[in-house]
Interface confidence: low
Amino acid sequence: NIDVCKLGTVTVQPAPVIPLGSAANISCSLNPKQGCSHYPSSNELILLKFVNDVLVENLHGKKVHDHTGHSSTFQVTNLSLGMTLFVCKLNCSNSQKKPPVPVCGVEISVGVAPEPPQNISCVQEGENGTVACSWNSGKVTYLKTNYTLQLSGPNNLTCQKQCFSDNRQNCNRLDLGINLSPDLAESRFIVRVTAINDLGNSSSLPHTFTFLDIVIPLPPWDIRINFLNASGSRGTLQWEDEGQVVLNQLRYQPLNSTSWNMVNATNAKGKYDLRDLRPFTEYEFQISSKLHLSGGSWSNWSESLRTRTPEEEPVGILDIWYMKQDIDYDRQQISLFWKSLNPSEARGKILHYQVTLQEVTKKTTLQNTTRHTSWTRVIPRTGAWTASVSAANSKGASAPTHINIVDLCGTGLLAPHQVSAKSENMDNILVTWQPPKKADSAVREYIVEWRALQPGSITKFPPHWLRIPPDNMSALISENIKPYICYEIRVHALSESQGGCSSIRGDSKHKAPVSGPHITAITEKKERLFISWTHIPFPEQRGCILHYRIYWKERDSTAQPELCEIQYRRSQNSHPISSLQPRVTYVLWMTAVTAAGESPQGNEREFCPQGKAN
């Protein structure tokens, strides 16, 4: 609330704006009849330096000239870029209690002269747009700097616009607001940018261009596609463009793809035929435009057109597999399974499958359609049967895929040898085998089939399978493989009319089982004890059980227990032991072992054999 500069004045020499590295003299003078009231000779003028409103220095020692009690001159050096505030204050030395009184102040700006603007670039967006130019201003000047953009052209065309840069805004682009029309296509235009501030001025080199150099067409709009005769592979792409466009670039890709198909089209006039599209596929289309074949700039890409191509009839071969089960002496159940076609083969939404089971002599033919990927029928056990399946969408059906129904494990001579299953990582298993030793007919292919060994898996879940060429002896199975689950894996060797198989159990990862088998009964028969148990619940097995252990020890004994190890068989749930003393009470329990280790013990049962020792 002080009336600044009522007491005196502050002046700067050579000027309040100075180049970096220069010194300045600041003079502070009291107005007549101002100063300390009692003793004018005791007037002391001091100069304070502020940066960003913070006092950084008292320049008492920089005084270069002094008229006692009237005026003082101070020299300031090493000023940093930007603005510095200096405030002159009056200190009446006879009164220590009163603070110095502000007299007046001055701002000194330190900066540099502007560099010549460089890299001028001009653009007109669309035939009806206006010319806008941008440039590189060079080093920051730290001063308010004015920029003038001047354009000159044919027929005495001149135009200019101005803007300025300071510590709040940057000026490196100006829109001239004029439109260059196509009838000036061959004409040359010149622009230059001039920069000026309190320390100097500079000018860019002239920048010359033509209409074609700077006009960027607007991106095409109103894009649509028409599929010829509802074809899934051929379509006409149509769009709207500015009138002067002579060249278009089209790009298109399926939505899940990572690489574009690119096409250049000359004089397309908003229309182009595409012939290599994939049926029933979501595509994205974009178009860009150019006004001249050799010169000029491409427009931005248009907005995307996203659409799905129509369906076409399915192609490809279904992968079929089957299971046979004898029902009684003259009937068998055939379950056919097949894998869905991949999208490039299905070429549409599969509506149903046509399934045919035929006795080779053509006596009997069973036909049906199903929307599922499996089909089960009961047929006579006599005769040679063949199955075929085709897939149908709204446009037609695929060629039927045939498979001969043979006894899959009927020929021991065709059974693969040395089948092994090795866990590779959490979600796959490597199955290897050796070819059949004495096959009397050539192996046409191997089928590796697997399913989880859980209750009801044969009826509830279809098998998974892989077809392997006859010269391969390994398969990495990963479909539906989960850790801590035991799978039954079968390797089938198929000839034209016979099959042989070998089976193994395997898991991709294992842990020791959560619990041991539950002993349900102990019975004594012919001086042997039969231990009966229930298997460990499926979720608690945590991999393939290799074997069970039966432990026993005399009740109250501290000795290590005896044990008997039994190779695991799913069908077995009892086992005899014969090394127990009669009329001695034993405690018995069981554990289960996977490749990762042994389970905790199951329930304990006490039993006292009555027969005589073996």
Partner: nanobody
Framework: QVQLQESGGGLVQTGGSLRLSCAAS?????MAWFRQAPGKEREFAAV???????YYANSVKDRFTISRDNAKETVYLQMNNLKPEDTAVYYC????????????????????WGQGTQVTVSS
């Protein structure tokens, strides 16, 4: 054929510790340590069956710990509070076939043997 390679033996003072390792070149089910002191017969020290069932000779119980890393097919014998009478050549033994009714104490139950590693406990 499974090869066994022992390591970790050496000279240690009474009351000290050592850790022996035995790496198998294939999958095994039971892995055991036996030891043979100078002028004596080879004797059972410890066995691990499956992943976690362990048995020890009375002479090493509460001082030795047997463990295994199934992923590496390696068995370890951590020997603490060693005594001069623990001085011996320590042998690793393994069985790939699961034995029927033994408990892993008997040498005859093992198909595969390592070359041995010397452990010397000085007083």
């Amino acid at each position: 054929q499974v090869q066994l390679q022992e390591s970790g033996g050496g000279l240690v003072q009474t009351g000290g510790s050592l850790r022996l390792s035995c790496a198998a070149s294939g999958r095994t089910y039971a892995m055991a340590w036996f030891r043979q002191a100078p002028g004596k017969e080879r004797e059972f020290a410890a066995v691990i069956i499956g992943g976690d069932r362990t048995y020890y000779a009375n002479s090493v119980k509460d001082r030795f710990t047997i463990s295994r890393d199934n992923a590496k097919e390696t068995v370890y014998l951590q020997m603490n509070n060693l005594k001069p009478e623990d001085t011996a050549v320590y042998y690793c033994a393994a069985n790939r076939r699961l034995y029927n009714s033994g408990r892993g104490y008997s040498q005859s139950e093992y198909e595969y043997w390592g070359q041995g590693t010397q452990v010397t406990v000085s007083s």
